[in-house]
Interface confidence: low
Amino acid sequence: HGTELPSPPSVWFEAEFFHHILHWTPIPNQSESTCYEVALLRYGIESWNSISNCSQTLSYDLTAVTLDLYHSNGYRARVRAVDGSRHSNWTVTNTRFSVDEVTLTVGSVNLEIHNGFILGKIQLPRPKMAPANDTYESIFSHFREYEIAIRKVPGNFTFTHKKVKHENFSLLTSGEVGEFCVQVKPSVASRSNKGMWSKEECISLTRQYFTVTN
C-alpha cells in the first residue's frame, strides 16, 4: 500500500444562482499523477454518489447534479486524493450546502433618465442551467430587496446608499448634472444569503434632461 496520501485540507462550495461550484485545496507535495475523486450526498438519500473519479483540477461544477437544490434539504460533498492505487481519506464539506449558501446576484442593471430622475430596472439572473420553472422570482418569491449604491462623477467618490424593495427604482438627482454610477446588491429580507455587488452601470445627466416648469 505504501505511504498514506494526505487528504485535501479543505473542501467548500461557492455558489451563485444555478452555478454551484465545489472547490478544494490541493494536498501538499502532490505528484503529476495526483487527481481528485468527488462524491455527492443528497440529504434524505443517505448514500454517496461518485461524480468524478479523477479530476485534475481544484474545482468541479456540480450545477447539473444539484439542480433540485432549491427544492431539497441540501447536499454534502466530499473529495479525496488519488494517486495510482493509493488514495487518501475523504474530506467532507463542513457545512450543509443548501439554498442558504447561494450568493445572490442580479443579471444586470439598466438605467435611463426621465425628467431629472434616474430610473433603474434590475434584471434578475437567468442562468441557462436553470429549469424553466425555477426562476429567481419564483424561488425567492417574497421579501426581495436591493441595496443601491450611487456614485457621482466627478466627485470625491462618496457613495449614497438606498434600499429598495422592487426591481424598479428611481433616484432623484436634485438637479445635479454629470455622470452617475450605480451598483446593486440583492438580498432577501427573510433569508441570510450573502449578496454580490453588481457591475457598476453609469449614465450621464445633462441639462437637456430637465423639464422647465413654472
Epitope: I21, T57, L58, S59, D61, T103, M196
Partner: nanobody, 125 residues
Framework: QVQLQESGGGSIQAGGSLRLSCVAS????????MAWFRQSPGKEREAVAA????????LYSDSNKGRFTISQDNAKMTVYLQMNSLKSEDTAMYYC??????????????????WGQGTQVTVSS
C-alpha cells in the same frame, strides 16, 4: 507549484494584432474563472476579458468588446487573448489571473487570488 506564465507581448504598430498566452499549472487550470487584466502606468489594473474554463463561457469588458477575443486550449492548459485593431491606448502590461474569490465582482482585480508576472504590450502610432 501553482503558477501562471504569460507570453506573446511585444511592440507593434497601431492597427496590428497580437495573441497573448497564459499557461497555467495543472492544478490551477479549470479552477472557476481565468481572466486577463491590464495596467498602464499611473492607472489601476483593469479587466479585459474572462473565461469560465469548465464551459468556455466568455465575458468581456465593454471597452474592448469586438476587438479582443478570449479563448482556451484545455489540452495545453492555456488561455489566450487575441487582440486585433490595436490602438496606442492598448499599451499596458497584461496580466493573467485565476481563481475568483467567492461573492466578488468578476471584473475587479481584488477578486482574483493568483496572478502571473505580466507581459508588456506597446502599440505605437
Amino acid at each position: 507549484q501553482v503558477q501562471l506564465q504569460e507570453s506573446g507581448g511585444g511592440s507593434i504598430q497601431a492597427g496590428g494584432s497580437l495573441r497573448l498566452s497564459c499557461v497555467a499549472s495543472k492544478y490551477l487550470y479549470s479552477t472557476n474563472y481565468m481572466a486577463w487584466f491590464r495596467q498602464s502606468p499611473g492607472k489601476e489594473r483593469e479587466a479585459v476579458a474572462a473565461i469560465y474554463t469548465a464551459s468556455g463561457a466568455t465575458l468581456y469588458s465593454d471597452s474592448n468588446k469586438g476587438r479582443f477575443t478570449i479563448s482556451q486550449d484545455n489540452a495545453k492548459m492555456t488561455v489566450y487573448l487575441q487582440m486585433n485593431s490595436l490602438k496606442s491606448e492598448d499599451t499596458a502590461m497584461y496580466y493573467c489571473a485565476a481563481v475568483r474569490k467567492t461573492g466578488s465582482y468578476l471584473f475587479d482585480a481584488q477578486s482574483f487570488t493568483y496572478w502571473g508576472q505580466g507581459t508588456q504590450v506597446t502599440v505605437s502610432s
